[in-house]
Interface confidence: low
């Protein structure tokens, strides 16, 4: 059910500053279905819209995760962003039923960066200049920050790899390409293997 | 083919107020915003608010908060902007554009000339 | 406010040559999926007409000679070969936050 995870990521990251404060705001106050709790003001605030895609999931589930995020969508007149989430609603048989089902990390499986994890955070040395491609695009300041603490390679590799699970595609494409630019023979190597 | 048509050029005392009206055709009324934007003459475009006509929902310019009203009529497909309180700095050229999903302003009215004087 | 400042203020292109106009937030207003900046075109007497949203998406029927580039904090506008009916000043806006501003805007003369 990974789709709805993307199709609500991609959503929020659509979504102008002002647009998403806005999204924030009425998500603290929209009607929830009992038994749901509410993302709390504090952290909620703070958050970028891959962390809110995250807060959003282990909250609400995927399937009334992708609900809420079409009624506050609505509720904002983002007719035409909350009917792409419709669709991918009704491709993906969404559910109501699916809300009891515990949220699974369903990131996708055959993208190169799943695939190669292991090896990714032992060979790539030249982290910093994976993540000055990444920085603005993929990785918020505070990621970004985050993993240039950690002190060694492979410290710094588990670090940026601790964000993966939220990304989509168009994400993991992008440290693709930073990988291909800044270790071209280690990525040759791993395709080829 | 959408179209804008704003009311007629307006000549008002200091103090006063006007009801410009933006009546729109063309396209779906409730599925779009309408934004206002203030020109003076010879200078830039001003933002001075939107609304969304599906739900009423209006932001506004902090500078116009107080000075502007936004409100629709679903009915007719029009959008309104009340201007209170004139002064000579309010004279200008006022558009009404339609909001499109990045708020850009895809379609503009020809324009409502208001001039304020005694 | 998110100030966005155009330049030049004005500029004089001979016909068939390049124009190019930049635009500079004062904070950035892009995410990884949109650049919120938008160009316009307004003519004499005229409203302004949208050329460009999300930095470079072409608006439906505007002529292919104007390109837009840029995100973050830096956009720019290139029209090129340049036409008599290009004189016109254009301005920039950004929607990223409230208020949405414009740029002060950039008159392009034809020579």
């Known amino acids: 059910m990974g789709r709805a995870r993307d199709a609500i990521l991609d959503a929020l990251e659509n979504l102008s500053g002002d647009e998403l404060k806005k999204f924030k705001m009425k998500l603290l106050t929209v009607q929830l279905r009992e038994g749901y709790g509410r993302i709390p003001r504090g952290a909620l605030l703070q958050m970028d819209a891959i962390d809110l895609t995250d807060k959003l999931v282990s909250y609400y589930l995927e399937s009334y995760g992708l609900e809420l995020t079409m009624t506050v969508l609505r509720d904002m007149g983002l007719q035409e962003l909350a009917e792409q989430l419709q669709t991918t609603k009704e491709e993906s048989g969404a559910v109501a039923a699916a809300a009891s089902v515990p949220a699974q990390s369903t990131a996708r499986t055959g993208h190169f960066v799943d695939q190669h994890r292991q090896a990714l955070i032992a060979r790539v040395t030249e982290v910093d200049g994976v993540l000055d491609a990444l920085h603005g695009s993929v990785l918020t300041e505070g990621q970004y920050q985050a993993v240039r603490a950690e002190t060694t390679s492979q410290d710094k590799m588990r670090k940026l790899f601790s964000f993966v699970p939220s990304w989509n595609l168009t994400c993991k494409d992008s440290l693709l390409q930073a990988l291909k630019e800044i270790h071209p023979y280690l990525v040759m190597d791993l395709e080829q293997s | 083919e959408v179209q804008l048509q704003q009311s007629g050029a307006e000549l008002v005392r200091p103090g006063s107020s006007v009801k410009m009206t933006c009546k729109t055709s063309?396209?779906?009324?409730?599925?779009?915003?309408m934004s206002w934007v203030k020109q003076r003459p010879g200078q830039g475009l001003e933002w001075i608010g939107y609304?969304?006509?599906?739900?009423?929902?209006?932001e506004y310019n902090e500078k116009f908060k107080g000075k502007a009203t936004l409100t629709s009529d679903t009915s007719s497909s029009t959008v309104y902007m009340d201007f209170r309180s004139l002064t000579s700095e309010d004279s200008a050229i006022y558009f009404c554009?339609?909001?499109?999903?990045?708020?850009?302003?895809?379609?503009w009215g020809q324009g409502t000339t208001l001039t304020v004087s005694s | 406010d998110i100030v966005l400042t155009q330049s030049p203020a004005s500029l004089a292109v001979s016909l068939g040559q390049r124009a190019t106009i930049s635009c500079r937030a004062s904070?950035?207003?892009?995410?990884?999926?949109?650049?919120?900046m938008h160009w316009y075109q307004q003519k004499p007497r005229q409203s302004p007409k949208l050329l460009i949203h999300f930095a470079s998406n072409l608006e439906s029927g505007v002529p292919a000679r104007f390109t837009g580039s840029g995100s973050g904090t830096d956009f720019t506008l290139n029209i090129h070969p340049v036409e008599e009916e290009d004189a016109a000043t254009y301005y920039c806006?950004?929607?990223?936050?409230?208020?949405?501003?414009f740029g002060g805007g950039t008159k392009l003369e034809i020579k």
């Open positions: 904070q950035s207003v892009s995410t990884s999926g949109h650049s919120y």
């Open positions: 806006q950004h929607s990223w936050d409230l208020p949405y501003t």
């Open positions: 554009a339609r909001l499109n999903r990045g708020r850009a302003l895809d379609f």
């Open positions: 609304i969304y006509v599906g739900n009423g929902y209006t």
């Open positions: 063309g396209y779906s009324f409730s599925s779009y915003g």
